[in-house]
């Protein structure tokens, strides 16, 4: 931006300079250009010998300015163009000032004044562009400065050359009031703060309704001496509720929301939240609809699932599969997750309590991800009674809970777990063993082997011990062991059937298990 | 010294023509705007028309446009005025006149020009 | 067009004396006007060209002034060979027009 602090042109003949000596050398004249009339300082003494001609502006208020640019448009016409080439002719002038903190006026001293520089034309009118009316116009600019004092004069020091000026413009250069990155930034006056920096930096101040980013720089610009905006540095952003729109930020419109400040613009509110009010910065919940504390505010509020589906309890001798499918509502989460609790109860007393402490499950059964569990080390004879809920993101925020029950009644001991202890070329000693919990139940063990392949006889040994040695076999020859404990309410759950191997008569004592 | 020398005037019968010269010599001619300046007998000066160094632009004065032609020849040193449709009111002195840019001290040109220099004139009469 | 009033049409004066012509321009011409001296039977002279610039060999007796519509030329110390019919020119338009005479007589 550049402010105008003397304008000879624009003033149409109203400035009154001072010309020194009075009424030579340079004289205001009128021309008609281009069917305008123009004004110009003019003085073409170029055939009377040495000239010391002189032409004072009025004073000039200096306002802020430190450097003011001098930019002048004139004309020079060629010497040669003159009849015996004017032998004192010249084709420059000379450039002044001088500065003052009060008008002289018409008190016009030369020793005042510093040169600025000496003016030629680029370009000198010859004869023939004289004739044709081309004015050959030159435009020169001159910087001045630092400048201290209220105001300044120019002057213009004709020494015999044919000149017009035909435009004299004083000016100083501010950077524009400007607005970037949601910042304003201040006209400022451009000045170099040294000659190793020669830009001006500018803090900027957030618009309404921006701020600046938490842990970011404060809007900055750098103001040259040409009067232009360099390298922004920082910036503002829309505050929560609000969003950029063009230089401005704007509230959130009904049914929008934003929640930190940002570049983003405001999002719709999203699924099952209530309509915002303007300038809303998150959308509340509608009833029984729930937000995790870990949810943004953009994702849909969600419920807590209901009952997993289709619970199923498999009993297999002490053990329990249970098997499950997923809520049919998921509440819009994806994070569900299962608990599974244990109750038994006496089907003497109709005593009921809880059984984690004596039961065990396949995996920990309170963070759930898949589907089924089985639950080992079950009582005979006893009811047991399965819950398995299902639980999201937001079940925490609820009282009620989402289960499904399932009972098994264990009629049987768990199997007993069986091992090959020993082996010879004749015989076989196998051990096994029960739950502690169980072993009191079990009144005698029981034995069945025979040679595999042979279905049509087999022997049985019974103890009450957790051990055997089956003897008077033959070497080198696979049977089939099974164990199965006997209750006093009769058979319990028997063992796989195992396939142990006799030892050949050339001898190992390795044991094939 | 600079001299202008005009010739071809004389009666003529209204409608009728007559062409004007100027012989120009003691100056570079092709550096001269040239023009035509007409006094009417007892009467004030009146200019009548124009034309640059090198023969352009010309320019008219009203009371004389679509009947009178200036123009020049550089290689004979010689301005011409083809007057047509005389009437009576161009009863007249006609002189050439000639200006020269070099010789006026101003840096930029008028918007017209004035007359450095003057012929001695020829006269022209339109009667019946 | 440009008009160009002269006053007076004539005056009388003697020699030695100061004489002065004024010419009206019927809008601004700025100085863009010129004297001329006719006498009878003869083409006319310049004197002054923009106003107040007096042509090579005029003598320094003659002397113009003014601008924009108000002109004058001055005769300081009136000579024997000054008496003579004085025209105003202006060139600021290019229908150059002529002011109608002002005629200085002997007394």
């Known amino acids: 931006k550049e402010v105008v602090l003397l304008d000879f042109a624009a003033m149409k003949g109203e400035l009154g300079w001072l010309t020194h000596p009075y009424g030579k050398g340079w004289d205001l004249m009128q021309n008609i250009m281009d069917d305008m009339p123009i004004y110009m300082y003019s003085v073409c003494n170029v055939v009377s010998g040495d000239q010391d001609n002189w032409l004072r502006t009025n004073w000039v208020y200096r306002e802020e300015a430190e450097r003011i640019f001098i930019e002048l448009k004139f004309t020079v016409r060629d010497c040669n163009s003159f009849p015996g080439g004017a032998s004192s002719c010249k084709e420059t002038f000379n450039l002044y000032y001088a500065e003052s903190d009060v008008d002289y006026g018409t008190n016009f001293q030369k020793r005042q004044f510093t040169k600025i520089d000496t003016i030629a034309p680029d370009e000198i009118t010859v004869s023939s562009d004289f004739e044709a009316r081309n004015v050959k116009l030159n435009v020169e600019e001159r910087m001045v400065g630092p400048l201290t004092r209220k105001g300044f004069y120019l002057a213009f020091q004709d020494i015999g050359a044919c000149v017009a000026l035909l435009s004299v413009r004083v000016y100083y250069k501010k950077c524009p009031e400007m607005l970037q990155s949601l910042a304003r930034f201040p006209e400022t006056i451009a000045v170099a703060v040294s000659d190793t920096q020669p830009l001006a930096t500018v803090a900027g101040t957030c618009v309404d309704h921006a701020v600046v980013p938490y842990g970011g720089e404060g809007p900055l610009m750098h103001c040259t001496v040409d009067g232009e905006w360099l390298v922004p540095i920082g910036q503002c952003l829309c505050q929560e509720g609000y969003e950029k729109v063009e230089d401005a930020c704007r509230a959130c419109s009904p049914g929008f929301f934003k929640s930190e400040a940002s570049e983003s613009p405001c999002l719709e509110c999203p699924e099952h939240t209530l309509p915002s009010t303007e300038g809303a910065t998150s959308c509340q919940c509608e009833e029984g609809y729930f937000r995790a504390p870990e949810d943004p505010l953009s994702m849909s509020c969600t419920r807590p699932p209901s009952a997993p589906n289709y619970l199923t309890a498999i009993g297999m001798g002490a053990k329990v599969e249970l098997r499950w499918t997923a809520p049919k509502d998921t509440g819009g989460r994806q994070d569900i997750v299962y608990s599974v609790t244990c109750e038994q109860c006496w089907p003497e007393s109709g005593e009921c309590g809880p059984c984690e402490a004596s039961v065990r499950y396949s995996e920990p059964p309170h963070a759930l991800t898949r589907t089924s569990v089985t639950v080992s080390d079950l009582e005979p004879h006893m009811n047991y009674t399965f819950a398995v809920e299902a639980r999201n993101g937001v079940s925490g925020l609820v009282t009620s809970r989402s289960f499904r029950t399932a009972s098994v009644s264990i009629n049987q001991t768990e199997p007993p777990k069986v091992r090959l202890e020993d082996r010879s070329t004749t015989s076989l000693s196998v051990t096994w063993s029960i739950p502690v919990s169980q072993q009191s139940r079990v009144w005698k063990y029981e034995v069945t082997y025979r040679k595999k392949g042979d279905a049509n006889s087999y022997n049985v040994r019974r103890t009450e011990g957790f051990s055997v040695t089956l003897d008077d076999l033959a070497p080198d020859t696979t049977y089939l062991v099974q164990v199965q404990a006997l209750t006093q309410e009769g058979q319990g759950a028997g063992s796989k059937v195992h396939e142990f191997q006799t030892l050949s008569t050339e001898g190992s004592a390795n044991m094939a298990v | 010294e600079v001299q202008l020398l005009e010739s071809g005037g004389g009666l003529v019968q209204p409608g009728g023509s007559l062409r004007l010269s100027c012989a120009a010599s003691g100056f570079t001619f092709s550096h001269y705007m040239m023009a035509w300046v007409r006094q009417a007998p007892g009467k004030g000066l009146e200019w009548v028309s124009r034309?640059?160094?090198?023969?352009?632009?010309?320019h008219y004065a009203d009371s004389v446009k679509g009947r009178f032609t200036i123009s020049r020849d550089n290689s004979k040193n010689t301005l011409y005025l083809q007057m047509n449709s005389l009437r009576a009111e161009d009863t007249a002195v006609y002189y050439c006149?000639?200006?020269?840019?070099?010789?006026?001290?101003?840096?930029?040109?008028?918007?017209?020009?004035?007359?450095?220099?003057w012929g001695q004139g020829t006269l022209v009469t339109v009667s019946s | 067009d440009i008009q160009m009033t002269q006053s007076p049409s004539s005056l009388s004066a003697s020699v030695g004396d100061r004489v002065t012509i004024t010419c009206r321009a019927s809008?601004?011409?700025?100085?863009?006007l010129a004297w001329y001296q006719q006498k009878p039977g003869k083409a006319p002279k310049l004197l002054i060209y923009k106003a107040s610039n007096l042509h090579t060999g005029v003598p320094s007796r003659f002397s113009g002034s003014g601008s924009g519509t108000e002109f004058s030329l001055t005769i300081s110390g009136l000579q024997p060979d000054d008496f003579a019919t004085y025209y105003c020119?202006?060139?600021?338009?290019?229908?150059?027009?002529f002011g109608q005479g002002t005629k200085v007589e002997i007394k």
């Open positions: 020119q202006q060139y600021q338009s290019y229908s150059r027009t």
């Open positions: 034309i640059g160094p090198s023969g352009g632009p010309t």
């Open positions: 809008q601004s011409i700025s100085t863009w």
């Open positions: 006149a000639g200006y020269d840019s070099g010789y006026d001290y101003v840096a930029v040109a008028g918007p017209a020009e004035y007359f450095q220099h």
